[in-house]
């Protein structure tokens, strides 16, 4: 879902915090992608985003490799990245970026993060000169309280991110419970 | 002009299964969802499940085993199925388009088709 | 599930009334509520999305208010062709529940 034209800017890192403490190992597993915003996000009238799930796997050399898997072209899509710890703990960058083209920043941010049932992390890319971001809503299971939901709405706006811009992708029968 | 009509076998025999077909106009079976919902006499509306515009679906965790639903969108044509039918799945059967994104509302509704399991 | 009530089944008005009609959801649906109207001929038509969002062609009479648990849909100015059941919806959480509906009455 890309509407690039006039993107909302990314805001300063100053005002995205930090999971304090954050613990590599109990982030792993499987997170499903319950709430989903950003400034290439745009909620359509007609049918909704449909729900994702990633999967976090910690390597040897403390690297994720990140999978996420969603329903495209009436099957089961595959997408593998590695995510490369930062500057601290919770921090991540994009490995092997030069693969990517035109691709020249990538940057993750666990926001916050209780691991066994909800976590926010911030996503920060340039591609093609154009700066992005996102923050995912991550849930263990396919639905969070209305409380969770509502602290995802916030923290988004306080980003600068309209309601349009904020959307909680449906449960679907496919791929995400393989 | 959008419309959807149901159209099902009204009588279906305890055990066997019913096939419901929505038959749209006005509008594309790619861009929209269409549900597949039911009132029994007497109760509440029940949503049941549906198939989105991408051909992905989503169903009533509590009826799913029993449930399948397709389409054919150049037909314009949703299919509706449910299995091991009973009395109490005596029903009105609606399909209604998806509408407003993530607000999951539904904007037409067909007239709806009387099934009795007897 | 969720279990959406609406208390009052049948109500009887006078055209011209303003005519307001609940919904109480078993938990918080956080504005995720829609409200249709069922004609006596079976026709359903989408009234009001996310508590308070007016359908295309809905007339300006019809409007919707609420949050948390506790919702309502307003008819100002009652019109005959309002006379039909009213029942609203949950898109907050699967699965997507109804309210078992209130029917209008002519006195």
């Known amino acids: 879902q890309d509407s690039t034209s006039d993107l909302i800017p990314a805001p300063p890192l100053s005002k995205v915090p930090l999971q304090q403490n954050f613990q590599d190992n109990q982030f792993q597993g499987k997170w499903y992608v319950v709430g989903l915003a950003g400034n290439a996000i745009l909620r359509e009238d007609k049918d909704p985003q449909k729900m994702y799930a990633t999967i976090y796997e910690l390597k040897e050399d403390k690297s994720y490799n990140v999978t996420s898997v969603l329903f495209r072209k009436k099957k089961c899509d595959y997408w593998i990245r590695t995510f490369v710890p930062g500057c601290q703990p919770g921090e991540f960058t994009l490995g092997n970026i030069k693969s990517y083209p035109g691709l020249t920043s990538y940057l993750v941010r666990v926001v916050s993060t209780n691991y066994n049932q909800h976590a926010m992390v911030f996503f920060k890319k340039v591609s093609q000169n154009r700066e992005y971001f996102k923050i995912t809503l991550y849930g263990r299971t396919k639905e969070l309280t209305s409380e969770l939901k509502e602290n995802f709405i916030r923290f988004s706006k306080s980003l600068g991110l309209p309601e349009n811009h904020i959307v909680f992708p449906v449960p679907i029968d496919q791929c995400i419970d393989g | 002009e959008v419309q959807l009509e149901e159209s099902g076998p009204g009588l279906v025999a305890p055990s066997q299964s019913l096939s419901i077909t929505c038959t749209i106009s006005g509008f594309s079976l790619t861009s929209y969802g269409i549900h597949w919902l039911r009132q029994p006499p007497g109760k509440d509306l029940e949503w049941l499940v549906v198939i989105w515009g991408d051909g992905s679906t989503t169903s009533n965790s509590a009826l799913k085993s029993r449930l399948s639903i397709s389409k054919d969108n150049s037909k314009s044509q949703v299919f509706f199925k449910m299995s091991g039918l009973q009395t109490d799945d005596t029903a009105i059967y609606y399909c209604?388009?998806?509408?407003?994104?993530?607000?999951?509302?539904?904007?037409?509704w067909g007239p709806g088709t009387s099934v009795t399991v007897s | 599930d969720i279990v959406l009530t609406q208390s009052t089944s049948s109500l009887s008005v006078s055209l011209g009334d303003r005519v307001t009609i609940n919904c109480r959801a078993s938990q918080d649906i956080s504005n995720y509520l829609n409200w249709y109207q069922e004609k006596p001929d079976g026709t359903v038509k989408l009234l009001i999305y996310f508590t308070s969002r007016l359908h295309s062609g809905v007339p300006s009479r019809f409007s919707g208010s609420g949050s948390g648990t506790d919702y309502s849909l307003t008819i100002t100015n009652l019109e005959q062709e309002d006379i039909a059941t009213y029942f609203c919806q949950q898109g907050n959480t699967l699965p997507w529940t109804f309210g078992g509906g209130t029917k209008l009455e002519i006195k």
């Open positions: 209604a388009r998806h509408r407003y994104s993530d607000y999951h509302a539904m904007d037409y």
